[in-house]
Interface confidence: low
Amino acid sequence: VLEVYYTHLRCRCVQESSVFIPRRFIDRIQISPRGNGCPRKEIIVWKKNKSVVCVDPQAEWIQRIMEMLRKKSSSTPPVPVF
């Protein structure tokens, strides 16, 4: 599930990881675009083990997953989590 959560709060990610997370461990991905109170794009991966990881948007693996999800969900608009 590819989701965009627009917020007027500050940045959420205090540190970002580029470590690969296998797709089978991923529950969902959230994208906070640049702006809305944060000067950078943030990608947050919700893992199936109940943890959350902020991912480096430049990491090649997350870009591949996002591209695939974009194609998959192009017909349906993203739904906010909260």
């Epitope: 990881s17 943890s51 959350v52 990881v53 909260f82």
Partner: antibody, heavy 123, light 111 residues
């Protein structure tokens, strides 16, 4: 404001089933990422995590006690329940209800606690 | 299970001085660059209160004299300067692996 309140029988006998209720306000267990759990503390001793339940009905148990534990929820009533079967004197403790995390869904620490309910198992 | 060993079991510190509490895990509690170690304060007759989450993040409303540090297996809670209100028992907790576990506690007293 998040508030949690535990209730229990106070005293029960060995081999009985302990039924605990956590009534909470200030959040809903239907909200994505919310979890409620139980922790106990024998008098003057340390803390032991027992179980927790997530908004999506995912349930986690302490393996050392799993065979005796059942956690459930009544989302519409803002309540979570814990049953401990076949209690023994070692189950005498203060039982705390907790809400888990809430900081951007990382869901891994006990952010809010009830005042606790004291349970004594005695013959 | 991940065993958390706190040291010392108790310590007495003079007002205004620094108190340092250690928590050592039997295996790493880090995951994807995040340390899943948290600290709580418990006063007599009260439930524990969250102080620090993810090793070093200060919970909202907690005074800045509390700080946390560490990674993988070795973590520290520092109280500096110590005040009379800090007399309590402090617990560490890990949530990297089920079952989530707590340290045995460290009792802080005023010298």
């Amino acid at each position: 404001e998040v508030q949690l309140q535990e209730s229990g029988p106070g005293i029960l006998q060995p081999s009985q089933t302990l039924n605990l209720t956590c009534s909470f306000s200030g959040f809903s267990l239907s909200t994505f990422g919310m979890g409620v759990g139980w922790i106990r503390q024998p008098s003057g001793k340390g803390l032991e995590w027992l179980a927790h339940i997530w908004w999506d009905d995912d349930r986690r148990y302490n393996p050392a006690l799993k065979s005796r534990l059942t956690i459930s929820k009544e989302t519409s009533k803002n309540q979570v329940f814990l049953k401990i079967a076949n209690v023994d004197t070692a189950d005498t403790a203060t039982y705390y209800c907790t809400r888990i995390a809430g900081y951007y869904g990382s869901r891994d620490w006990f952010a809010y606690w009830g005042q606790g309910t004291t349970v004594t198992v005695s013959s | 299970d991940i065993v958390l060993t706190q040291s010392p079991a108790s310590l007495a510190v003079s007002l205004g001085q620094r108190a340092t509490i250690s928590c050592r895990a039997s295996e790493s509690v880090d995951n994807s660059g995040i340390s899943f170690m948290h600290w709580y304060q418990q006063k007599p007759g009260q439930p524990p209160k969250l102080l620090i989450f993810r090793a070093s993040d200060l919970e909202s409303g907690i005074p800045a004299r509390f700080s946390g540090s560490g990674s993988r297996t070795d973590f520290t809670l520092t109280v500096n300067p110590v005040e009379t209100d800090d007399v309590a028992t402090y617990f560490c907790q890990q949530s990297n692996k089920d079952p989530w576990t707590f340290g045995g506690g460290t009792k802080l007293e005023i010298k």
